[in-house]
């Protein structure tokens, strides 16, 4: 029985050229996390964090994606093309799979404020 919930940074915005932290948090469960996958809007894999073997950043994103903090992911040197959905998938036992969604909007405006708050999608 899956009792946990995924909390995410929800809908966030950040400046073009800047950086942003994508964060998911699994709560309300004692399940053990074996692997966390991070995917972007076209469902291509950005990175995985395996509980035993650590972080693996997909080579194409190595210059712009940094692991952490925690099980989160930091996107750097943002472009307008980075706008869209991002997904964290928590593979756990004995519960199974949990999935969270974040929407990132990259703004041209110099007045764009990085806004992030934890919320349950």
């Amino acid at each position: 029985m899956m009792t946990g919930t995924i909390e995410t940074t929800g809908n966030i915005s950040a400046k073009k050229g800047g950086s942003v932290i994508l964060q998911c948090h699994l709560s309300s469960t004692m399940a053990q996390v074996t692997q966390v996958n991070w995917e972007q809007h076209d469902h291509s894999l950005l990175a995985i964090r395996n509980a035993e073997l650590g972080w693996h950043i997909y080579p194409a994103f190595k210059d712009r994606v940094a692991p952490g903090p925690g099980l989160g992911l930091t996107l750097q040197s943002l472009t307008m093309n980075d706008t869209g959905e991002y997904f964290c998938t928590y593979h756990t036992y004995p519960d199974g799979t949990y999935r969270g969604r974040i929407f990132l909007e990259v703004l041209e405006s110099s007045v764009a404020e990085h806004s992030a708050r934890f919320q349950i999608p």
């Epitope: 509980a51 035993e52 073997l53 593979h91």
Partner: antibody, heavy 125, light 106 residues
Framework: QVQLVQSGAEVKKPGASVKVSCKAS????????IGWVRQAPGQGLEWMGW????????NYAQKLQGRVTMTTDTSTSTAYMELRSLRSDDTAVYYC??????????????????WGQGTMVTVSS | DIQMTQSPSSLSASVGDRVTITCRAS??????LNWYQQKPGKAPKLLIY???SLQSGVPSRFSGSGSGTDFTLTISSLQPEDFATYYC????????FGGGTKVEIK
């Protein structure tokens, strides 16, 4: 084709060390983990640990901690397993095996689909 | 560590028989279970991963089922080349194998 070729049989004295190699070919070496499993004569399979060929991180079976070291050489697509302070009960066939899932498949890492032919290590005085 | 108990440890069967091997985990492992076949003097071969997914190139007479703590490998119609030892392996850290089931000719 995808294959793992291991080094030849070894005979060692108690207290010595052994280093077994496992050369990969036919796939992108850095996209898959490599695990090591051993099998004592007439016995079952025993998990030893594994290594990420991408970042070099390792995870070892607790009973072997401190005696085993797994490494990779990405320039030659070769994985190595060194076992130190050998005892008679380390006598076994040692297998390397490729993780069935690429790091980039999104699948949870865990099964092993391609295996080396095995390396017999005999520990005897 | 999670213990994996396979049963039976050995069985005798004839060509054409339906064979079932079970594997029980000491605690729930979701679907983190794989099955291997090993013939004497050879390396293990992956048959089933994630409890029920058939590995590419493996005949469809092999199937896997179960989740949580109880898992089954079924060979629907035993063939001469299927006489071997079968191992389950759980892939929850730290990985462990079952003790094996030897399938012999009756």
């Amino acid at each position: 084709q995808v294959q793992l070729v291991q080094s030849g049989a070894e005979v060692k004295k108690p207290g010595a060390s052994v280093k077994v190699s496992c050369k990969a070919s036919g796939y992108t070496f850095t996209s898959y983990p490599i695990g090591w499993v051993r099998q004592a004569p007439g016995q079952g399979l025993e998990w030893m640990g594994w290594i990420s060929s991408y970042n070099g991180n390792t995870n070892y079976a607790q009973k072997l901690q401190g005696r085993v070291t797994m490494t990779t050489d990405t320039s030659t697509s070769t994985a190595y397993m060194e076992l130190r302070s050998l005892r008679s009960d380390d006598t076994a066939v040692y297998y390397c095996a490729r993780g069935a899932s690429s790091f980039w498949s999104g699948d949870v890492l865990g099964a092993f689909d391609i295996w080396g032919q095995g390396t017999m290590v005999t520990v005897s005085s | 560590d999670i213990q994996m108990t396979q049963s039976p440890s050995s069985l005798s069967a004839s060509v054409g028989d339906r064979v079932t091997i079970t594997c029980r985990a000491s605690q729930s492992i979701s679907s983190y279970l794989n099955w291997y076949q090993q013939k004497p003097g050879k390396a293990p071969k992956l048959l089933i991963y994630a409890a029920s997914s058939l590995q590419s190139g493996v005949p469809s007479r092999f199937s896997g089922s179960g989740s949580g703590t109880d898992f089954t490998l079924t060979i629907s119609s035993l063939q001469p080349e299927d006489f071997a030892t079968y191992y389950c392996q759980q892939s929850v850290p730290p990985r462990t194998f079952g003790g094996g089931t030897k399938v012999e000719i009756k």
